[in-house]
Interface confidence: low
């Protein structure tokens, strides 16, 4: 990484100090929960074309939504919308205004959580939303993945992949249509295999901008551009995962 | 045998309405997102409503918002486009598509609307 | 919803190589999005001959091939036939979940 962090993006965009970000980082305890050895369906071959990926999106079994987040301010706390058909707003009905207000964060209970584990974005992502993945990567990690799922589309998918043919890679890429679109892959590999990791994704307007235990990671331009449909998170992979959030700031 | 066919085009006034249908066997059809697109006599290909298998998403290309609806029934491996207040300039074949994001990989052989007076 | 701009016709030779290209915008061809080709003989559907840039589906000769660099994308067909004669449509998947084609290209064998 480059030694940037999202809190340096942002002081350079107009919120030198944003509500909600957090001044001393890596200090939360790493959690340690069962992982029930559930696996991302297909390898995701890098130069096979799309009728070689999987048609499915990634696993449903996720549990329902979650509860209220701890830690979060009392008045702030949302606990979720109820899971299941018509829990999520539909296309054409964005949330109304405030419904992201900055006083989060809102997200996952204590942890740890159940990997795959789904995280719902009621009102879609919006800009300067800003989701935080606490964990600790497995021994003989093999992948970890988070979607950001529209209905069955992923609009970013992002990908770290431990060992494809002997190296260190991370893959982001989209799914519409049932089809993965071009990947675009990063050599900066931060996570280590048995360790503790904080992923943050903040959304911008032109893009997903992505820091790993507090460096910049990498940012990939919104290829679906309706950010209100985007109405989960799905986090996946070889990772025992603490927490899972999000805020404005 | 993968295959679409359309049916229920015909002969309109301006201002008429008239309801398109696909009949889609031969694949796993709520598993796909279909497409009408359609093409004016002599003229290119156009583009103009998308839905997705499980009909949450729906889509329109300006020229027909407001006035076409599509709707799907899995149930009945069926597509269909409600068209109302139609113009003279929606005269053309209209294809029933099955799609992916790769490509548009099945077409029926297309349903002619006319729209004259 | 602007359409992608394609030549209106090219001409070739039996055995020679011809290409048609597609030029859009950072919002569609050059968005990271997948282009497709089509080739539709008179009076019949559209058939796709490319997808996802420059893939054949199974069926489609390996004379046709596609390439994209920024915001164009190409279409080469090599070793020219009689039956290649026909419109050829490009498209391209855009970010706010339509569809674009070109205008279409008329190819015509001498």
């Known amino acids: 990484a480059d030694n940037f962090s999202l809190h340096d993006a942002l002081s350079g965009s107009g919120n030198p100090n944003p509500q909600g970000w957090p001044g001393a980082w890596g200090n939360q305890p790493a959690g340690a929960g069962g992982y029930p050895g559930a696996s991302y369906p297909g390898a995701y071959p890098g130069q096979a074309p799309p009728g070689a990926y999987p048609g499915q999106a990634p696993p449903g079994a996720y549990p329902g939504a979650p509860g209220a987040y701890p830690g979060a301010p009392a008045p702030g706390v949302y606990p979720g919308p109820p899971s299941g058909p018509g829990a999520y707003p539909s296309s054409g009905q964005p949330s109304a205004t405030g419904a992201y207000p900055a006083t989060g964060p809102y997200g996952a209970p204590a942890g740890p959580l159940i990997v795959p584990y789904n995280l719902p974005l009621p009102g879609g992502v919006v800009p300067r939303m800003l989701i935080t993945i606490l964990g600790t990567v497995k021994p003989n990690a093999n992948r970890i993945a988070l979607d950001f799922q529209r209905g069955n589309d992923v609009a970013f998918h992002f990908n770290p992949r431990f060992n494809e043919n002997n190296r260190r890679v991370i893959v982001c890429n989209t799914k519409l249509d049932n089809n993965w679109g071009r990947e675009e892959r990063q050599s900066v590999f931060p996570f280590e295999s048995g360790k503790p990791f904080k992923i943050q994704v903040l959304v911008e307007p032109d893009h997903f901008k992505v820091a790993v235990n507090d460096a910049h990671l990498l940012q990939y331009n919104h290829r679906v551009k309706k950010l209100n449909e985007i109405s989960k998170l799905g986090i996946s992979g070889d990772i025992d995962l603490t927490s899972a959030s999000y805020t404005m700031i | 045998e993968v295959q679409l066919v359309e049916s229920g085009g015909g002969l309109v006034k301006p201002g008429g309405s008239l309801r398109l249908s696909c009949a889609a066997s031969g694949f796993t059809f709520s598993n796909y997102n279909m497409n009408w697109v359609r093409q004016a006599p002599g003229k290119g290909l156009e583009w103009i409503s998308s839905i997705y298998g499980s009909s949450r998403y729906i889509y329109y290309a300006d020229s027909v918002k407001g006035r076409f609806t599509i709707s799907r029934d899995n149930a009945k491996n069926s597509l269909y486009l409600q068209m109302n207040s139609l113009r003279a300039e929606d005269t053309a074949v209209y294809y029933c598509v099955r799609s992916s994001y790769g490509g548009m990989d099945v077409w029926g052989r297309g349903t002619l609307v006319t729209v004259s007076s | 919803q602007s359409a992608l701009t394609q030549p209106a016709s090219v001409s070739g030779s039996p055995g020679q190589s011809i290409t048609i290209s597609c030029t859009g915008t950072?919002?569609?061809?050059?968005?990271?999005?997948?282009v497709a080709w089509y080739q539709q003989h008179p009076g019949k559907a559209p058939k796709l001959m490319i997808y996802?840039?420059?893939y054949r589906p199974s069926g489609v000769s390996n004379r046709f091939s596609g390439s994209k660099s920024g915001n164009t994308a190409s279409l080469t067909i090599s070793g020219l036939q009689a039956e290649d004669e026909a419109d050829y449509y490009c498209?391209?998947?855009?970010?706010?979940?339509?569809?674009?084609f070109g205008g279409g290209t008329k190819l015509e064998i001498k």
């Open positions: 950072s919002s569609d061809v050059g968005g990271s999005y997948n």
């Open positions: 498209s391209s998947y855009t970010g706010y979940s339509t569809r674009v």
């Open positions: 996802y840039d420059s």
